[in-house]
Amino acid sequence: NWVNVISDLKKIEDLIQSMHIDATLYTESDVHPSCKVTAMKCFLLELQVISLESGDASIHDTVENLIILANNSLSSNGNVTESGCKECEELEEKNIKEFLQSFVHIVQMFINTS
């Protein structure tokens, strides 16, 4: 599932490049392992912002699929309460390219620990 999430992220990146969306998004660029589920939640919430701002059907479908995949991969630990983690709004705001790069990085963290 996580490998498919990465391919969806690359698809979103390709779609966005042709659209010139210049939104800034809350981005966790240095994820601590004990906060990775919280960080994933922030990434997914921000991804929905991209979908809404783009108004593009392909981006919408890909984001929705990515959320479904992530949900299923995290169904066992998605409700784990992680303490001492930053709220989404406390994270740095970065451009979409940097946001997606950081997103791929956190997904790789999940791949490495699964």
Epitope: Q48, E64, N65
Partner: antibody
Amino acid sequence: EVRLMASGGGLVQPGGSLRLSCAASEFTFSNYAMSWVRQAPGKGLEWVSTISRGGDYTYYPDSVKGRFTISRDNSKNTLYLQMNSLRAEDTAVYYCARRVSMITGGWAMDYWGQGTLVTVSS
Amino acid sequence: DVVMTQSPLSLPVTLGQPASISCRSSQSIVDITGNTYLEWYQQRPGQSPRLLIYKVFNRFSGVPDRFSGSGSGTDFTLKISRVEAEDVGVYYCFQDSFVPYTFGQGTKLEIK
């Protein structure tokens, strides 16, 4: 008023194939994900499949995965369910349903068609 | 897979009286983004299912306000404040937080 009309049901032998259709009208079909849900005679509801708005993403339970294929033709406002290698336990009324977006709404099936009966028997 | 268990399976109610149906999931159905995709559907005799409640407590358009949904995590409830004759049918809870999406077995509401 949203309209969904399922058709294509009938009697088929075990191991046979059938293609169901669902004609949609009175809404912008391409703006919605769609699902199939079935109900065996006298039994409860079972989710069968969901397809994304553009048709790129499809989802199935293990009970039909590899045998059933959901697809759509947005130019014809039509949803399909191709059913292969049919078994007696696939006998059911099949309903098509419109899905509200996960991102903009509640991810629920807000409108349902009237259903078409599929009977698998020799 | 998430198993949805409803109770009771049969619910005889006097007209004008309240009714309550419970639905319990085998694991939490709160998704990673914090949403709980739990719906309630009504199926009247001989009819297609109809959406009543989505995301636990949101009433769908046109649904009478005597229907209400509540709950969180793994325990959910559908309440009908005053049962009317047209409420007869089978009620299903449904989770679509995690694939495969799953229905409860259904609760048959009948008039005493």
